[in-house]
């Protein structure tokens, strides 16, 4: 097991998850750790505890390894980091990779007020409701590098979007969370259409793909006090 030392260390590796950092309960996920071609061992840590290791074969000139989690559960959801060893030296820790398990327990309802098709500048609010006890709700936009939002609430949360712009158009889903890394099933999608303005056309996403595997996320700061944490939502984290 890696010995902590603040002396000489190698550059930190890059860690990412494929196909996504959001994994349906029971599905598999690959965690990649990219270090150096000279690395003799990679170690993966989960919530600060040693999780797995791999010793690359010298015959393969690869600077990364893949750790395979065969069945994602609430027990494997959380924060992962990796290290690598080259010679006698260990690298610094990678940035944290936060894996979320979805598809737990129940499915929330999502709706939008006043309606799914609104004019540019109109005030819009999303509502997410989940019957089972939860304390936090997440609203996600498909295919967006726009922000994910979260709100605290018992059974229901509202997400005021303010006066909408064209950037708000797209398809949304919400989740209830049982902790930061264990989420409900996704709601049915709600597509927000924006009309009026210069182009005066209903703008919905042209890409019909709605698989979570293709979503990109960013976490915004809001009144709940959560700071923006791009490492959580980017598939790859570095620097």
């Amino acid at each position: 097991q890696r010995i902590n030392t603040e002396k000489e260390t190698l550059p930190k590796p890059i860690i990412w998850a494929k196909p996504s950092i959001m994994v349906t309960n029971g599905n598999s996920v690959n965690i990649w750790c990219q270090g150096a071609q000279s690395a003799s061992e990679y170690q993966l840590y989960f919530e600060g505890s040693f999780f797995a290791l791999e010793r690359p074969k010298p015959s393969r000139s690869m600077n990364k390894v893949r750790f395979f989690i065969s069945q994602m559960t609430s027990h494997t959801a959380g924060i992962y980091t990796c290290f690598y060893q080259s010679g006698e030296l260990w690298s610094k820790s990678s940035n944290p990779l936060k894996l979320v398990v979805t598809g737990l327990y129940d499915t929330p309802n999502l709706w939008v007020y006043p309606r799914p098709e609104v004019t540019l500048g109109e005030n819009v609010t999303f509502f997410c409701q989940l019957k089972t006890a939860t304390s936090k709700f997440f609203l996600l936009k498909e295919r967006g590098s726009n922000h994910i939002q979260n709100k605290y609430g018992n059974i229901q949360a509202e997400f005021p979007m303010g006066p909408v712009t064209r950037a708000h158009r797209g398809t949304y889903r919400c989740f209830g969370s049982y902790n930061d890394y264990a989420w409900s099933f996704p709601s049915e999608p709600v597509t927000l259409l924006i009309t009026g303005g210069v182009e005066n056309s209903s703008l919905a996403p042209t890409d019909p793909t709605s698989s979570l595997d293709y979503w990109e996320f960013d976490l915004s700061t809001n009144e709940s006090g959560l700071q923006k944490d791009s490492a959580f939502w980017d598939h790859t984290t570095q620097n």
Epitope: A52, L53, F68
Partner: nanobody, 127 residues
């Protein structure tokens, strides 16, 4: 579905040896990474040793390094734990566990990674 059945446990004197076996059912054994864990009375389950699916890379807990050896026979769908120089503190129920399927030469140390477990076999070390 994978079923794991441990055998070979028993009572032994300090300094003695035992070999535990874990027989796996199904055709997925060759694609499984395997591990041994143990749980002493009143204590949490702890990692003992693990082996990768293909080339047989191994990893051991510091407490057993140099005394225990993990190995596998893919033709027999069996993983072994050879235990020697046994001590009183090795007394525990020993569990075999599998990660099915897995990839490459991953060696899993954390119990959360394992998705199949045996029922355990008791090892008692006493004079």
């Amino acid at each position: 579905e994978v079923q794991l059945v441990e055998s070979g446990g028993g009572e032994v004197q300090p300094g003695g040896s035992l070999r535990l076996s874990c027989a796996a059912s199904g055709r997925t054994f060759a694609s499984a990474a395997m591990g041994w864990f143990r749980q002493a009375p009143g204590k949490e389950r702890e990692f003992v040793a693990a082996i990768s699916r293909s080339v047989g890379d191994t990893y051991y807990a510091d407490s057993v390094k140099g005394r225990f050896t993990i190995s596998r026979d893919n033709a027999k769908n069996t993983v072994y734990l050879q235990m020697s120089s046994l001590r009183a503190e090795d007394t525990a129920v020993y569990y075999c566990a599998a990660v099915v399927p897995t990839y490459g030469n991953n060696i899993y140390v954390h119990s959360a990674a394992y998705n199949y477990w045996g029922q355990g076999t008791l090892v008692t070390v006493k004079p």
